[in-house]
Interface confidence: low
């Protein structure tokens, strides 16, 4: 239904009253100038907030800041700035929150010139006492905690030397010199690059990548030649420059750099990139970027060894390294992922795959939706998305799209509906559905959030003038409540809700600003009285998902499998609660030829489901280096998509061939790898 | 009216073989999947075969993988069983039923009897 | 293969009482079950689907419940023409699996 608060919205009885008894405000004893705020374990109601404010004056800048915690999910804070000895703390480098409910922070401070180190300040029980550290070292990043142990850290040094600690900061031990870029990987381990002649910058593409899995007891190079490298899911990915020229090729690894395979991508020139988009332990989605300066590139995706790749979708919008892209995976259904195209006509369209890169389409219009000046055909046009490059392009959006696991199909974005993105003012759309249908939602920007699993949709119109209202909905945005949470509007900065969405508190930031000061407020609003009681079994109803023509047999079948979900009925006011936990039933899927890929040396003409061999490549010696050793590969053109779980039906079996093929990639091969102890 | 009418049946020597047809008319028949279920003497129900909507994928149980071939002909709305190599465990009376992605067991004809004795 | 087991195998009821036929999965099926009628002499008709979905024109004496492994239907004031075997149905995954039935017979 059309959003708004016509007859058909059963509006929430008494909200008013029952949203002002759960709404507290807090006033900052501060100058405004930057708030950072990190929530600390999960369901703990622990929030710290920083602010800082510098003061430049005439030979230097002072800086002030000031540490506030709650633990009653921001409701009431308490100033702590006397637990790190009221030091300035370094905003750019945040609030290192240890990993899962370690209950750990570490905080940065700002120190004097002449020191010989950085100072940390560290706590390990959820920020009620900080413990003061001075460093051997000048911090150059943050501090990284291993995912596996979160007493182990490591950091970057402004010398480039690799520091860990076994002690959550205590002591502090260079484990390497010359190092570039460092990373924890799985079990501990830690992964580096180091540079030989003068600096990361000017060794780039000599740099060596090495490896150690006792936190710096000994070491292994697993890699010469390096650009850079990177880890997604169970893969290791290596940018491994070419002997004769300046190109470079992907080089990938299952088992910690132990063996390399070359990565069946093209390779790239000086100005150009690779991109890991997205990685699981099934797969990955590669971003090669075309040569030029196109601001373009096309997305691979790979079978299971992360060697073989199909191409996924062509003229994939992302402009420079490290630029811009609105590759999104939407969390809230297995699949589903959305980005943009630069058309030939230099328009930006929005595709969506529901397949993990099998299939990409344009969206579906929304029904209450007209196409706008971008469309040819004012009948037929689609919606697309606002993300990541409409906000580096300062357009009027003020959030990338949202969607959350627990809040099943639920989707939520800025969008324009045409034939292309429109610089004009967006609106909000939401889907129910995983992304297969859409329904504009509210008129016009928004901040917007999801609460208690999708229960509450909460949304605050994005203006540039100060604010007071808050709109919510209990029905997954088809009617909206709006609700003043205070008399005098605020210069509005943001809204905070606890990661995860089962939260059922939201925080409103702002500022007041008064002819002579202005301060820091926030408004934390809990609407557990508006969800009154605890959803039931009949608050629920069952959703196939990826559901298209309920009469096909194979309805919902997506890489293998269906599945089922119990979700909340959009007529149900009732909580979720924290402890939700979505309840969904897979069921198997008879197999057909869209479940496997090709495999290397094959390829699937247009329109055509079966992989043939590639005609250039017959009785050829081919170009396929695996685990960097001379071997027969055998293949049977077919290989079954990654985390595809079908059973039965087609069963391609095609004649075993032997592709003969030479190594004429052996940087990363095991006999050139050394090994080294402290 | 939705109905499904079998037939083919008969009475066949163990390893002889017998081809079994399910008539659709009533709805359209190339948007459902179909199935073949047996009830055997005892009463017990076991689920033989699926097939797709469009025909291209089949399932078998794997007391009858390989002996029995699910088919169909949109065109005809017709539905069949081709069954090989008969044991006289595949006594029973065949029925053949409709699915759907949400309902597997929607609609079921009236039943064909089939006897394999020597 | 899922093992569906249902009870009882029979019961002797009167017109009007409420009765309920369980069937127990041998592993969690969430809500992929159905239950089927089938009268003396005749074929079978789809009564519930998904566990606790009514299909349509059957009547709301008629009703489905449980999810994971233990699933009951329940026929509330029964009536003359419901004295027939019931069956269960498992379509979580293949091969798809029956119970051996329940037979509801006069008192």
């Known amino acids: 239904s059309a959003p708004g608060e016509d007859e058909e919205c059963g509006r929430v009885r008494d909200f008013v009253a029952k949203l002002a008894n759960n709404t507290h405000q807090h006033v900052f004893d501060d100058l405004r100038g930057s708030v950072s705020l990190s929530w600390v374990g999960d369901s703990t109601g622990v929030i710290l907030v920083l602010t800082t404010f510098h003061v430049p004056l005439v030979i230097m800048t002072f800086g002030q800041s000031k540490l506030y915690r709650s633990e009653d999910y921001g409701k009431n804070f308490k100033d702590i700035t006397d637990l790190i000895n009221n030091t300035f703390i370094r905003t750019e480098f945040g609030m290192a929150i240890g990993p899962e409910n370690s209950g750990k922070v570490v905080l940065t401070a700002e120190v004097s010139g002449g020191s010989r180190g950085g100072r940390i300040f560290r706590s390990s029980d959820f920020a009620k006492n900080f413990v003061q550290t001075d460093l051997p070292f000048h911090p150059l990043t943050q501090m990284m905690y291993s995912p596996q142990n979160s007493d182990y850290l490591l950091a970057l040094s402004t010398e480039n030397g690799l520091w860990v600690s076994k002690n959550f900061g205590g002591k502090w031990e260079e484990i390497h010199k010359a190092v570039c870029l460092a990373k924890w990987g799985s079990d501990n381990t830690i992964f580096f690059t180091t540079y030989a002649n003068g600096s990361c910058k000017a060794d780039l593409g000599a740099l060596e990548l090495w490896r150690t899995s006792d936190l710096g007891k000994s070491f292994k190079t697993i890699g010469v030649k390096i650009y850079s490298f990177g880890l997604g899911g169970r893969f290791l990915f290596a940018s491994v420059m070419a002997d004769k020229d300046t190109t470079r090729r992907i080089h990938v690894s299952t088992d910690q750099g132990d063996t390399w395979s070359m990565a069946q991508l093209p390779s790239v020139g000086q100005e150009q990139f690779y991109s890991i988009l997205a990685a699981n332990d099934d797969m990955v989605f590669m971003h090669v970027d075309e040569p030029g300066d196109t601001g373009f590139g096309t997305i691979f995706t790979s079978d299971d060894r992360g060697i073989v790749y199909s191409k996924s979708l062509d003229r994939h919008l992302y402009t420079t390294t490290g630029g811009e892209t609105d590759f999104t995976n939407v969390t809230s259904l297995r699949g589903v992922y959305i980005t943009s195209v630069l058309s030939e006509d230099n328009s930006i369209q929005t595709m969506i795959t529901f397949d993990q890169g099998g299939r990409w389409t344009h969206l579906r219009k929304p029904e209450n939706s007209e196409c706008d000046a971008t469309a040819k055909n004012k009948n037929e046009c689609s919606l697309h998305i606002h993300a990541s490059y409409s906000i580096s392009q300062k357009l009027n959006v003020p959030m990338a799209p949202l969607s959350e696991p627990n809040a099943v199909g639920i989707v939520i974005a800025h969008g324009s509906v045409g034939d292309a993105i429109s610089v004009m003012v967006p609106d909000v759309y939401i889907s129910d559905d995983g992304g297969y249908s859409w329904t504009k939602m509210l008129e016009g920007p928004h901040y917007y959030t999801i609460l208690d699993s999708g229960g509450i949709i909460v949304a605050i119109e994005h203006s540039s003038r100060p604010i007071n209202v808050i709109k919510f909905s209990t029905d997954e945005g088809q009617c909206w409540q709006t609700y003043t949470f205070t008399r005098d509007p605020i210069y509005f900065t943001g809204l905070a809700s606890e990661p995860g969405a089962r939260s059922m508190n939201i925080s409103i930031w702002g500022f007041t600003e008064s002819f002579l000061t202005s301060q820091w407020v926030s408004y934390t609003i809990d609407f557990k009285d508006i969800l009154e009681r605890n959803c039931e079994e009949k608050d629920y109803t069952i959703w196939l998902a990826h559901s298209t023509d309920p009469e096909d047999y194979e309805d919902g079948c997506i890489l293998g499998y269906k599945e089922q979900f119990l979700r909340l009925r959009k007529s149900s006011v009732c909580q979720n609660g924290r402890d939700y936990v979505v309840t969904k039933q897979p069921s198997i899927c008879l197999c057909s030829l869209e479940d496997f890929l090709c495999d290397f040396g094959y390829y699937r003409p247009e329109n055509d489901s079966k992989c043939v061999e590639q005609p250039e490549l017959k009785g050829h010696d081919l170009e396929f280096c695996l685990y960097g050793r001379e071997e027969h590969l055998t293949t049977n053109g077919y290989r079954k998509i990654p985390g595809d779980k079908c059973q039965g039906g087609v069963n391609p079996v095609r004649e075993v061939k032997d592709l003969k093929k030479k190594c004429t990639s052996n940087f990363l091969s095991p006999e050139k790898q050394n090994s080294k102890s402290n | 009216e939705v109905q499904l009418v079998e037939s083919g049946g008969d009475l066949v020597k163990p390893g002889g073989s017998l081809k079994l047809s399910c008539a659709a008319p009533g709805f359209t028949f190339s948007t459902y999947g179909m199935s073949w279920v047996r009830q055997t003497p005892d009463k017990r129900l076991e689920w033989v075969a699926i097939i797709s909507s469009g025909g291209s994928y089949t399932y078998y149980s794997d007391t009858v993988k390989g002996r029995f071939t699910i088919s169909r002909d949109n065109a005809k709305n017709t539905l069949y069983l081709q069954m090989s190599s008969l044991k006289s465990e595949d006594t029973a009376m065949y029925y053949c039923?409709?699915?759907?992605?949400?309902?597997?067991?929607?609609?079921w004809g009236t039943g064909t009897t089939v006897t394999v004795s020597s | 293969d899922i093992l569906m087991t249902q009870s009882p195998s029979s019961m002797s009821v009167s017109l009007g009482d409420t009765v309920s036929i369980t069937c127990h999965a041998s592993?969690?099926?969430?809500?992929?079950i159905g239950w089927l009628q089938q009268k003396p002499g005749k074929s079978f008709k789809g009564l519930i689907y998904h566990g606790t979905n009514l299909k349509d024109g059957v009547p709301s004496r008629f009703s489905g419940s449980g999810s994971g492994a233990d699933f009951s239907l329940t026929i509330s004031s029964l009536e003359s023409e419901d004295f027939a075997d019931y069956f269960c149905v498992q379509y979580a995954q293949f091969p798809y699996t029956f119970g051996g039935g329940t037979k509801l017979e006069k008192r």
């Open positions: 039923s409709r699915s759907s992605s949400h309902w597997y067991f929607d609609v």
């Open positions: 592993q969690g099926i969430s809500s992929n």
